[in-house]
């Protein structure tokens, strides 16, 4: 009896959908695996007789529920199928946006770049897919614990009237208000402000 794959899960970030599993202990030899997806009542092979423990399902439609399954194989024997269901538009993890930060005196000027949909040739981004897409920004004085959050209305934001000659850290994430779903935070970018531009009277 061939044991089934273990810990079967979907690892999906920005619609790059990788089904992953672990090979069970099997004394007779090395196992191979076949992974399939359901397409209108028929299961279609995606990865056949692979020695890998993952399979790329990124071509599946972003919309709708998909049934995926994987089994282990050895010679003419095979395990039972392990099934999972997956809805990319609901389940994919929203990766961190890009961010450009420029210091102008006592202001930080930020521009945000929505994460690209993985593995497509064109420049479609997660913002295209989700109509309610917005950004959350949090910033803080470097070395302090107090963080401030803002929700920019556009793909850019300016933090004004900051303390001069002070290092501020900023990070951004995507947020979907209609789903109450937050993406991953970008790595913090820390920049030092310069002088206060106000002219003494």
């Amino acid at each position: 009896m061939v044991p089934p794959p273990e810990n079967v899960r979907m690892n999906s970030v920005n619609f790059k959908n990788i089904l992953q599993w672990e090979s069970p202990a099997f004394a007779k030899g090395n196992l191979t695996f076949t992974a399939q997806y359901l397409s209108y009542r028929i299961f279609q092979d995606k990865c056949m007789n692979t020695t890998l423990t993952e399979c790329d399902f990124s071509s599946l439609s972003k919309y709708g529920d998909h049934t995926l399954r994987v089994r282990a194989e050895f010679a003419d024997e095979h395990s039972d199928w392990v099934n999972i269901t997956f809805c990319p538009v609901d389940d994919t993890i929203i990766g961190p946006p890009g961010m450009q930060v420029e210091v102008l005196a006592d202001s930080l000027h930020m521009r945000f770049l929505a994460p690209k949909i993985e593995n497509e040739y064109e420049t479609w981004t997660m913002k295209n897919v989700y109509n309610s897409w917005t950004y959350n920004v949090q910033y803080w004085k470097n070395g302090t614990d107090e963080k401030f959050q803002i929700t920019p209305q556009y793909d850019f934001e300016v933090l004004r009237n900051l303390e001069p000659w002070t290092t501020y850290c900023v990070q951004v994430r995507g947020f979907l208000p209609d789903r109450n779903k937050a993406g991953e935070w970008s790595e913090p970018v820390c920049e030092q402000t310069t002088h206060d531009e106000t002219v003494p009277s």
Epitope: Q44, S59, Y63, E120, Y121, E122, N128
Partner: nanobody, 126 residues
């Protein structure tokens, strides 16, 4: 939300021609990968012709050289020109779309398209 509406089906003699249309709503039509599928009575739905957002096309072996898929981004419409029709082309024809997609995956399976029309009937008699 994308809405698709097929038209142009009908009855034709073997050897004749038909042109199917699929009107799509949405202002990002140029970003769609699209396809035509068909389902004959008692058979599974099968892919017929596909066009990616970059305009590249693919066909099922059974229709290669007889059918031509195209799309007019200005009119938000997908077409299937069917020539030299055969009785075995008789089926309900459906158009399908996947927004924000490109030619990266050469989509041709039903599970790779998220939006579907209601279908238009094509009947070819001998």
């Amino acid at each position: 939300q994308v809405q698709l509406q097929e038209s142009g089906g009908g009855s034709v003699q073997a050897g004749g021609s038909l042109r199917l249309s699929c009107a799509a709503s949405g202002d990002t039509y140029s970003s769609y990968c699209m396809g035509w599928f068909r389902q004959a009575p008692g058979k599974e739905r099968e892919g017929v012709a596909f066009i990616d957002s970059d305009g590249s096309t693919r066909y099922a072996d059974s229709v290669e050289g007889r059918f031509t898929i195209s799309k007019d981004n200005a009119k938000n419409t997908l077409y299937l020109q069917m020539n030299s029709l055969k009785p075995e082309d008789t089926a309900m024809y459906y158009c399908a779309a996947e927004p924000y997609c490109s030619g990266g995956y050469h989509r041709k399976e039903m599970a790779e398209f998220g939006y579907w029309g209601q279908g238009t009937q094509v009947t070819v008699s001998s």
